[in-house]
C-alpha cells in the first residue's frame, strides 16, 4: 500500500462559498470517501471555513498507510467582497468594453495571492480591470471572468455587452 | 521584496516639464490602483494623481489637473507622472504608493524623488 | 474639498506616556456603503510614510496593539498607549472616502519632553 501521503500529494480542492452563513466548504477532488482527522469531513467536503484563514486537514483512506496527507486549505476571501463592474464610458460605448473587479471590502487575505481572468472570445487577458477598444458597433459580446486564490477558483462571473450604435456617418 | 523605486526627479525652472518613474517590482503590479503623493518642503502630505489597475481610470486634484498626466506601463512594471506647466508650489518629495483598490489602503511607499521649481 | 484638521501640531510625551492625536474632517467622511475610510500613517525621519490604522480602527499587519484607532463621523482620535523610542515621528490621518478626492491631515510631530 502507498502512504496516503503519496497517494494524496497531488490532490486538488474546489472552495464553494455560501452567501448566507458567509463561510466556505472545501471540496477535495478525490474518487474514494476519505477520513480527515480532526476535521470533519462529510462526502470528501470540509464545511464552515472561515475566509482568508488557513484549516489543516489529515486526510487518511483504508487503501493507504501512516504518514497521512497533511492538506493546509488555505481559503479565499469573501465572494461578496469582489464585484464585476461595467466601466465603459457613456461616450465611447459603440465601440468599447471596458470591465473591472472592484474590491468593495478590504479583508486579510494576502491581495498577492490572488489573480483575475478574462476571457471575451478567443481573447483571455490576466488583469483585474480590462479595456477593449476598436470594437464593432452593435455587436454583442460575451466575457467570462474568474477570480484565483492560489490558483484556486473561488468565484467567477459573465457579462454580456451589447455595443452602442455608431454615430451617424460614421 | 515589494518594492517602490522613483526616479527623475531634478531641478527645473518654472514652467518646465518632467516626468518621473516608479519602477514596482516585488508583486503583481498590474492587480494594484497606483497613485503619486507628494510632500512639500513645510511637510504636508498630498495626494497628486490616480490610475486604476489597468489603467483605466485617472483621478487629480484640481491644483494639477491639466498640467499632470499619470500613466502606467503594465508590461514594464512601471508607473510615471508626467509634469508640465511646473510652477515653484510643485517643489516637493514625490512618492508613488500602491492601493489594492480605491477603497483599501496606500500599503508600501517608495522612498521618493525630489523635484524643485526655481528659476 | 474635505479638509482635514489635526491637532495638536506638536505633541510633547515623556516615552512611556499616553499620547493621543485628533483628526477632524470639514464633512462626514462616512461612505454611502457604510464604512469610513480614515487612515493613519506614521512617518519617521527620513523615511517614507508607513500605514497604521485604516478604516478608523483596524491595525495593518505588524502594526504594535498599543496603537489605536477610535471615532466617527467627522472625529477620529490615535491613541498611543505607552509611547516607545521607535514612536517619534509625524503622524498624518487620511481620509478616503470622497473617491477620488483623497486628502491628508497637516499632521502631527511626535516629540520626547
Known amino acids: 500500500k502507498p502512504t496516503c501521503d503519496e497517494k494524496y500529494a497531488n490532490i486538488t480542492v474546489d472552495y464553494l462559498y455560501n452567501k448566507e452563513t458567509k463561510l466556505f466548504t472545501a471540496k477535495l477532488n478525490v474518487n474514494e470517501t476519505v477520513e480527515c482527522g480532526n476535521n470533519t469531513c462529510t462526502n470528501n467536503e470540509v464545511h464552515n471555513l472561515t475566509e482568508c484563514k488557513n484549516a489543516s486537514v489529515s486526510i487518511s483512506h483504508n487503501s493507504c498507510t501512516a504518514p497521512d496527507k497533511t492538506l493546509i486549505l488555505d481559503v479565499p476571501p469573501g465572494v461578496e467582497k469582489f464585484q464585476l463592474h461595467d466601466c465603459t464610458q457613456v461616450e465611447k460605448a459603440d465601440t468599447t468594453i471596458c470591465l473591472k473587479w472592484k474590491n468593495i471590502e478590504t479583508f486579510t487575505c494576502d491581495t498577492q495571492n490572488i489573480t483575475y481572468r478574462f476571457q471575451c472570445g478567443n481573447m483571455i487577458f490576466d488583469n483585474k480591470e480590462i479595456k477593449l477598444e476598436n470594437l464593432e458597433p452593435e455587436h454583442e459580446y460575451k466575457c467570462d471572468s474568474e477570480i484565483l486564490y492560489n490558483n484556486h477558483k473561488f468565484t467567477n462571473a459573465s457579462k454580456i455587452i451589447k455595443t452602442d450604435f455608431g454615430s451617424p456617418g460614421e | 521584496e515589494v518594492q517602490l523605486v522613483e526616479s527623475g526627479g531634478d531641478l527645473v525652472k518654472p514652467g518646465g516639464s518632467l516626468k518621473l518613474s516608479c519602477a514596482a517590482s516585488g508583486f503583481a503590479f498590474s492587480n494594484y490602483d497606483m497613485s503619486w503623493v507628494r510632500q512639500t518642503p513645510e511637510k504636508r502630505l498630498e495626494w497628486v494623481a490616480y490610475i486604476s489597475s489597468g489603467g483605466v481610470s485617472t483621478y487629480y486634484p484640481d491644483t494639477v489637473k491639466g498640467r499632470f498626466t499619470i500613466s502606467r506601463d503594465n508590461a514594464k512594471n512601471t508607473l510615471y507622472l508626467q509634469m508640465s506647466s511646473l510652477k515653484s508650489e510643485d517643489t516637493a518629495m514625490y512618492y508613488c504608493?500602491?492601493?489594492?483598490?480605491?477603497?483599501?489602503?496606500?500599503?508600501?511607499w517608495g522612498a521618493g524623488t525630489t523635484v524643485t521649481v526655481s528659476s | 474639498d474635505v479638509l482635514m484638521t489635526q491637532t495638536p501640531l506638536s505633541l510633547p510625551v515623556s516615552l512611556g506616556d499616553q499620547a493621543s492625536i485628533s483628526c477632524r474632517s470639514s464633512q462626514s467622511i462616512v461612505h454611502s456603503n457604510g464604512n469610513t475610510y480614515l487612515e493613519w500613517y506614521l512617518q519617521k525621519p527620513g523615511q517614507s510614510p508607513k500605514l497604521l490604522i485604516y478604516k478608523v480602527s483596524n491595525r495593518f499587519s505588524g502594526v504594535p496593539d498599543r496603537f489605536s484607532g477610535s471615532g466617527s463621523g467627522t472625529d477620529f482620535t490615535l491613541k498611543i498607549s505607552r509611547v516607545e523610542a521607535e514612536d517619534l515621528g509625524v503622524y498624518y490621518c487620511f481620509q478616503g472616502s470622497h473617491v477620488p478626492m483623497y486628502t491628508f491631515g497637516g499632521g502631527t510631530k511626535l516629540e520626547i519632553k
Open positions: 504608493a500602491r492601493r489594492y483598490d480605491v477603497w483599501w489602503y496606500f500599503d508600501v
